[in-house]
C-alpha cells in the first residue's frame, strides 16, 4: 500500500502523459486523480511505466471502482490487464467483443493465463452461449480453446458456430467432447454435398456413431488412417470388413501398420478371419472359420 501524502506543489497531473514515468510511487498516488486516469486509460498503454508504477495506477482504479471497472475502462486497460487477478476480473461485466479482443491481444502468442480464462468465462456466461463471432475470436487467439471446455459447456455452442471451427481447434479434444460437437457439426453441414461434407465433418468424426460411419462408407470418401484411428471404438466394432474397406478406400493398406492399436486391434478381433483375408493385408487375430459368434448384448436386449 502507498502512504497517503500531499502532492508536491506544481506536480498535480493535468493529463496522463510521459512526464508521469518520472514520478515516484507516492507522487503518482498523491498527484494523479483516479477519475482523470479512468478517462485517459487509453494513454497508459503507450507510456513505459514500470510494474511498480502500474501497481499504483491499478490501486487508484480499484479505489474508484470497488465494485468492478466499467467496460469503458476495461476496454483500454492494455498492459494493466496483466496486473489484474482472477478475483478482480470476476467483478467485471464484459459484453463487447471489441473489449475481449483488446484484452486477448495483450496475452497474444502465449498460453492462456488464469486471468484470460476468467475473462473468457465471464464473457461467455454474459452472452449466454458461445456464438460464432465469439468462437471465431477465441479460436483465433487460442486454437485449443474448444477442447478446454467441458461437455456441458460445449452443449451451449449453437450449430451455426461450428462453421468457425478449424481442424487444429479439435486436436486436443477427447471423445466425450467430440460426442457433443459431432451432432452439431452434422446439423451445421447437412446441406453440403458428399465430398464437401466429408472435408468439413472429418475432424469431428471422433464423435460419430456406427450408422453414420456405415453411411459414409457408401460415399467413396477415402478416409485416411489418422482419422480412422480417432473414431470411437464402439462405433467401429460393428462395421464389416467390406464397410471398412469402402470407408478407407486406398488407405485400407494402412490397417496392417495399426493392427496392434485401438480401434483396429479390437475391430480385427470381431471379424471373421476369412473376411479379413479378403483384404490381402495379412491381418491376423480374427475369429477362426467354423466358430459361431454370439452377440450377448443383443440377446440381453431381447430378453
Amino acid at each position: 500500500e502507498v502512504e497517503k501524502t500531499a502532492c508536491p506543489s506544481g506536480k498535480k497531473a493535468r493529463e496522463i502523459d510521459e512526464s508521469l514515468i518520472f514520478y515516484k510511487k507516492w507522487e503518482l498516488e498523491a498527484c494523479v486523480d483516479a477519475a482523470l486516469l479512468a478517462t485517459q486509460m487509453d494513454r497508459v498503454n503507450a507510456i513505459p511505466f514500470t510494474y511498480e508504477q502500474l501497481d499504483v495506477l491499478k490501486h487508484k482504479l480499484d479505489e474508484l471502482y470497488p465494485q468492478g471497472y466499467p467496460e469503458s475502462v476495461i476496454q483500454h486497460l492494455g498492459y494493466l490487464f496483466l496486473k489484474m487477478s482472477p478475483e478482480d476480473i470476476r467483478k467485471w461485466n464484459v459484453t463487447s467483443l471489441e473489449t475481449l479482443k483488446a484484452l486477448l491481444e495483450v496475452n497474444k502468442g502465449h498460453e492462456m493465463s488464469p486471468q484470460v480464462a476468467t475473462l473468457i468465462d465471464r464473457f461467455v456466461k454474459g452472452r449466454g452461449q458461445l456464438d460464432k463471432d465469439t468462437l471465431d475470436t477465441l479460436t483465433a487467439f487460442y486454437p485449443g480453446y474448444l477442447c478446454s471446455l467441458s461437455p456441458e459447456e460445449l452443449s451451449s455452442v449453437p450449430p451455426s458456430s461450428i462453421w468457425a471451427v478449424r481442424p487444429q481447434d479439435l486436436d486436443t479434444c477427447d471423445p466425450r467432447q467430440l460426442d457433443v460437437l459431432y451432432p452439431k457439426a452434422r446439423l451445421a453441414f447437412q446441406n453440403m454435398n458428399g465430398s464437401e461434407y466429408f472435408v468439413k465433418i472429418q475432424s469431428f468424426l471422433g464423435g460419430a456413431p456406427t450408422e453414420d460411419l456405415k453411411a459414409l462408407s457408401q460415399q467413396n470418401v477415402s478416409m485416411d488412417l489418422a482419422t480412422f484411428m480417432k473414431l470411437r471404438t464402439d462405433a467401429v466394432l460393428p462395421l464389416t470388413v467390406a464397410e471398412v474397406q469402402k470407408l478407407l478406400g486406398p488407405h485400407v493398406e494402412g490397417l496392417k501398420a495399426e493392427e496392434r492399436h485401438r480401434p483396429v486391434r479390437d475391430w480385427i478381433l470381431r471379424q471373421r478371419q476369412d473376411d479379413l483375408d479378403t483384404l490381402g493385408l495379412g491381418l491376423q487375430g480374427g475369429i477362426p472359420n467354423g466358430y459361431l459368434v454370439l452377440d450377448l448384448s443383443m440377446q440381453e436386449a431381447l430378453s
Epitope: 514500470t50 510494474y51 511498480e52 498492459y79 495483450v106 502465449h110 498460453e111 493465463s113
Partner: nanobody
C-alpha cells in the same frame, strides 16, 4: 526469462563523457521499453532516461540536453551517451527493461555499473 548486462561505467573528470551499454538476452521478443536508472549515495533509485520499442525517448529534467538514450533493436541493446558529466551524476547506473507479456511480465534489472565523476 530476461537477463540484462551493463558495461561502460568508470571514473571520469567533470565535463567528460561516458557511454553505457546494456545488452539483453533471453526472452527479448516482448520488450516494450528499456531505460536507465541511477542510485546515488544515500538517494532513492531514480529514472534517468527511457526509450520505447518504437524509439520514443524521455529524459529526467536533470539530464536533458546532456544525456542521450538509444536502442539497437536488432542487438537488443540500449545505450546511454553521457556528456558534460557533473559530480552529482555519480551513482550506480542500472539498466531496466519492461516485458509486457505472459508468461513472465515484469520489470527486469541489470546488476548495475558504477559511474564516478570526480577530479
Amino acid at each position: 526469462q530476461l537477463q540484462l548486462v551493463e558495461s561502460g561505467g568508470g571514473l571520469v573528470q567533470p565535463g567528460g563523457s561516458l557511454r553505457l551499454s546494456c545488452a539483453a538476452s533471453g526472452s527479448v521478443n516482448s520488450i516494450t521499453a528499456m531505460g536507465w536508472y541511477r542510485q546515488g549515495p544515500g538517494n532513492e533509485r531514480e529514472l534517468v532516461a527511457v526509450i520505447t520499442d518504437r524509439g520514443r525517448a524521455s529524459y529526467a529534467d536533470s539530464v536533458k540536453g546532456r544525456f542521450a538514450i538509444s536502442m539497437d533493436n536488432d542487438k537488443h541493446t540500449v545505450y546511454l551517451q553521457m556528456d558534460s558529466l557533473k559530480p552529482e551524476d555519480t551513482a550506480v547506473y542500472y539498466c531496466n527493461a519492461h516485458r509486457r507479456t505472459w508468461p513472465h511480465p515484469g520489470d527486469y534489472w541489470g546488476q548495475g555499473t558504477q559511474v564516478t565523476v570526480s577530479s
